[in-house]
């Protein structure tokens, strides 16, 4: 968002007054409170960055993220017999992505129509709440998954019901925490009419009084508590994991696991570099500039960073791929347009010819393979 202010003050996640209503008079609209944006912000709001680039990225995220996370959630819930902690965290990660991505058609339409929100105040608040909620949920569940991966390597004990229950408890706590920290986004008025541009923005222009102090403090707190601290935990887990893998004996199976672990680490690192770090950094810088100077010179960068943060919904499936054997199987077969059941039946058929006694350990109706840990 940029700063605007309203004319009894002017308004961008710019600055303005919160009680703006309007009534039509002839050709134009008479506004009760004017939200006036600076020229740079207006050029961003009407330019190709927000009306072409953003909808393209969001369309890609929607087209990739919806089916892949949908399939992942389905696999983790219905096609994975043993609900290991990692499966639980990944299921929550997929759910968080889905809850954000399902609103993207509205977001795409908003940007294509020149950043003009026509779907009402409530939907705008839901969209924004879920947008930020997804980012912070992803960070926290990714942290849990990373710590859990390290824990499994250090402490390779079998699956226990207790561990699964702890993972469920942690997941519920994360959802509750995110719900609480995003309450301000649902409560604050997010839609603002900009008379100069004849558009109603959603979150892109926010009231001055709110932004100057509160938004900076809010996003700074989130950046420290829900980004930096989890990022430190994630990095620590992976550094320790790499050390453990380096020092361990290398048979063929261990080598495969090591390669997969490295791919996972690279994927999570990419996610932090592309999605989480730029957005959290620029959220703080952007609101700091508004607070101190009344306008943000990094507005365009901030917009791009927030846009890129949604790519986590496309990157998460790669995490599932490197962690879950089940998801790997379903993903491969989905791409090859064949069912896992068919593949399993082929495997069973081949196995029974060679080892008739061993074939009893595979049920042709089974669609699960042990998740790799």
């Amino acid at each position: 968002t940029i700063q605007g202010t309203n004319r009894s003050s002017k308004g961008r996640s710019l600055i303005g007054k919160v009680d703006g209503t309007s009534h039509v008079t002839g050709k134009g609209v008479t506004v009760e409170t004017v939200f006036s944006v600076d020229e740079f912000s207006a050029s961003v709001l009407t330019g190709k960055l927000t009306t072409v680039f953003l909808p393209i990225v969001y369309t890609i995220v929607f087209v990739v993220g919806l089916p892949s996370n949908g399939m992942a959630l389905w696999v983790f819930l219905f096609r994975t017999k043993k609900k290991h902690p990692a499966v639980i965290y990944m299921a929550n990660l997929a759910l968080a992505d889905l809850l954000s991505v399902i609103w993207f058609p509205l977001k795409i339409a908003y940007h294509i129509h020149g950043n003009n929100w026509i779907y009402g105040e409530a939907l705008c608040n839901v969209l924004i709440g879920f947008f930020y909620g997804n980012m912070y949920c992803s960070i926290l569940f990714m942290t849990c998954l990373s710590v859990q991966r390290y824990w499994v390597i250090v402490n390779p004990m079998g699956h226990s019901r207790k561990k699964a229950n702890i993972a469920i408890g942690i997941s519920l706590a994360i959802w509750l925490l995110i719900l609480l920290v995003t309450i301000p986004l649902y409560v604050v008025k997010q839609t603002i009419f900009i008379p100069a541009l004849n558009i109603t923005t959603c979150h892109d222009v926010l009231p001055e009084q709110l932004l100057v102090g509160d938004m900076f403090n809010y996003f700074l707190s989130l950046a420290i508590g829900v980004f930096l601290f989890p990022a430190f935990l994630t990095a620590s887990a992976y550094v320790l994991m790499i050390r453990m893998l380096r020092s361990s004996a290398m048979d063929e199976n261990s080598e495969k696991k090591r390669k997969r672990a490295i791919k996972l680490i690279v994927t999570v690192l990419a996610m932090y570099l592309i999605c989480f770090t730029p957005s959290n950094l620029l959220l703080v810088v952007h609101y700091f500039l508004i607070k101190s100077q009344g306008q943000s010179h990094v507005y365009a960068l901030y917009i791009v960073a927030l846009c890129l943060s949604t790519l986590n919904s496309c990157i998460d499936p790669f995490v599932y791929y490197f962690v879950s054997h089940d998801f790997r199987d379903h993903a491969k077969n989905a791409l090859l347009c064949r069912s896992v059941r068919t593949v399993k039946q082929m495997q069973v058929s081949l196995t029974s010819k060679k080892h008739s006694r061993k074939s009893s350990s595979y049920s042709s109706s089974s669609t699960t393979v042990k998740t790799s840990y």
Partner: antibody, heavy 119, light 106 residues
Framework: QVQLQQWGAGLLKPSETLSLTCAVY????????VIWIRQPPGKGLEWIGV???????YYNPSLKSRVTISVDTSKNQFSLKLSSVTAADTAVYYC?????????????WGQGTLVTVSS | EIVLTQSPATLSLSPGERATLSCKAS??????LDWYQQKPGQAPRLLIY???SLHTGIPARFSGSGSGRDFTLTISSLEPEDFAVYYC????????FGGGTKVEIK
């Protein structure tokens, strides 16, 4: 060359409606609007209302119930109407060009029209 | 509503002298302050916008400074045509004019 030219009735009786026109030259109404400002004799400046080129308006809350500002894009003209005038509305009325953005000033002004309200 | 207080109300100086006009806002208006010059019987004329940007065609002897709540218009060396009334205008939150400072010949 940017120019704003004003005209309208100079002498009004109380309760009548003040009507002024501001014709603009040298710039596009797509990009600019105007603000109306008044200055009572020997006093400071007070803004009355603003209109964007797209027709959207915003009025000073203290005058809102009596003010109407409109635009005729075909003639490149803006008009100000102030109803139920009293002696307190006696002032020089100015129109000034405004880009419509927060960081833009009122860079060019009309010559001003003295309106006197007297019974 | 933001209130702008200009001081002094009147400034008596001779041509060639330096004039310093002050404008104080009741709250933070960042850089969104303009200065206008008005001569008797004329419309105000924009001199400085956004605290320190000189409007087209305005002589370099005019300069603006400040930020937040305290702003200054400086005329480095007064010319005979500079004797007039000067108004500040804030446009951060609504529009408010200051009461004006009259610069007169001593």
């Amino acid at each position: 060359q940017v120019q704003l030219q004003q005209w309208g009735a100079g002498l009004l009786k109380p309760s009548e409606t003040l009507s002024l026109t501001c014709a603009v030259y040298g710039f596009s109404l797509n990009s600019y609007g105007v603000i109306w400002i008044r200055q009572p004799p020997g006093k400071g400046l007070e803004w009355i209302g603003v209109i964007w080129g797209n027709g959207n308006t915003y009025y000073n809350p203290s005058l809102k119930s009596r003010v109407t500002i409109s635009v005729d894009t075909s003639k490149n003209q803006f008009s100000l109407k102030l109803s139920s005038v009293t002696a307190a509305d006696t002032a020089v009325y100015y129109c000034a060009r405004w880009r419509g953005y927060k960081d833009y000033p009122f860079d060019y002004w009309g010559q001003g029209t003295l309106v006197t309200v007297s019974s | 509503e933001i209130v702008l207080t200009q001081s002094p109300a009147t400034l008596s100086l001779s041509p060639g002298e330096r004039a310093t006009l002050s404008c104080k806002a009741s709250q933070n208006i960042y850089k969104y302050l303009d200065w206008y010059q008005q001569k008797p019987g004329q419309a105000p004329r924009l001199l400085i916008y956004n605290t320190n940007s000189l409007h087209t065609g305005i002589p370099a002897r005019f300069s603006g400074s400040g930020s937040g709540r305290d702003f200054t218009l400086t005329i480095s060396s007064l010319e005979p045509e500079d004797f007039a009334v000067y108004y500040c205008l804030q446009h951060n939150s609504g529009w408010t004019f200051g009461g004006g400072t009259k610069v007169e010949i001593k």
